[in-house]
Amino acid sequence: KAMHVAQPAVVLANSRGTASFVCEYASPGKATEVRVTVLRQADSQVTEVCAATYMMGNELTFLDDSICTGTSSGNQVNLTIQGLRAMDTGLYICKVELMYPPPYYMGIGNGTQIYVIDPEPCPDSD
């Protein structure tokens, strides 16, 4: 059975450079340990933005210096990416791995195009 991962096609970051989206996966089995990775695809290059491994029912824990935060609820992961700038506009792919128990499954979403617009600088006040 293939594992399907769904994510929104387009998300617009807010004025503070924060973008949130839901990554939902159709689990073929009863996973207890899940790893979620956010990847950015620019041209044909893929880089890791952030990753978290969590036990079902527990909170996602990203590294301290991660630009991502998130929460999980069943087969849904609510992801938030912070500190984005216009140059970070691109396709953000959600990858889900069911690490335990066997069998292992991996699924990849089609990607969320995140648009980031840098705020206009405030005009000088006299």
Partner: antibody, heavy 118, light 108 residues
Framework: QVQLVESGGGVVQPGRSLRLSCAAS????????MHWVRQAPGKGLEWVTF????????YYADSVKGRFTISRDNSKNTLYLQMNSLRAEDTAIYYC???????????WGQGTLVTVSS | EIVLTQSPGTLSLSPGERATLSCRAS???????LAWYQQKPGQAPRLLIY???SRATGIPDRFSGSGSGTDFTLTISRLEPEDFAVYYC?????????FGQGTKVEIK
């Protein structure tokens, strides 16, 4: 650039043990899952075993389960394969391979030959 | 376990001809989870196609992948001398990771 270099192959008698190593360089080793794949002489590719990022999760082909053990040392950027109770049918070139971000095996080592013979 | 069956076992063609290689899965494979590899004698396999149709870095555009579900195809539009090799399909969406038995593309 990404490099994977296997070592430890050789000729060994049936029932004996051998430990293969795969030295990784050119990338952040702990951010990638890794595999061993083997190829018997003149045959196709056979997946052998997988290890997760931190070494906590391991999966094995039925043909090696209970005999082979995969491990990794992220501080040394090295992947290992401990092979016990070797059989003639384990004779093969053993490759280590890196899982790319999107799942395929994007980099492979040059392989190390293991020959099990009396 | 997902069994991958490749056909034909051997393909005899001349340089400049088109090669069409087939890979059939015993159950559904997500299109994001199928790859093709090329292997030449004495060398390690090299990733050609991932996600069923995306070319790996440095792979020429004469190589293309297609398909979904259980039927996948690797096409080499015009065979170059260096393309004569063995080609393997692989699914990487679930354990155990599995490969097809390979298709040998040889010079006619």
């Amino acid at each position: 650039q990404v490099q994977l270099v296997e070592s430890g192959g050789g000729v060994v008698q049936p029932g004996r043990s051998l430990r293969l190593s795969c030295a990784a360089s050119g990338f952040t080793f702990s951010h990638y899952t890794m595999h061993w794949v083997r190829q018997a002489p003149g045959k196709g590719l056979e997946w052998v075993t997988f290890i997760s990022y931190d070494g906590h999760n391991k999966y094995y082909a039925d043909s090696v389960k209970g005999r082979f053990t995969i491990s990794r040392d992220n501080s040394k950027n090295t992947l290992y394969l401990q092979m016990n109770s070797l059989r003639a049918e384990d004779t093969a070139i053993y490759y280590c391979a890196r899982t790319g971000w999107l799942g395929p095996f994007d980099y492979w080592g040059q392989g190390t030959l293991v020959t099990v013979s009396s | 376990e997902i069994v991958l069956t490749q056909s034909p076992g051997t393909l005899s063609l001349s340089p400049g001809e088109r090669a069409t290689l087939s890979c059939r899965a015993s159950q559904e494979v997500g299109e994001s989870e199928l790859a093709w590899y090329q292997q030449k004698p004495g060398q390690a396999p090299r990733l050609l196609i991932y996600g069923a149709f995306s070319r790996a870095t440095g792979i020429p555009d004469r190589f293309s992948g297609s398909g979904s579900g259980t039927d996948f195809t690797l096409t080499i539009s015009r065979l170059e001398p260096e393309d004569f090799a063995v080609y393997y399909c692989q699914q990487y969406g679930s354990s155990p990771w599995t490969f097809g038995q390979g298709t040998k593309v040889e010079i006619k």
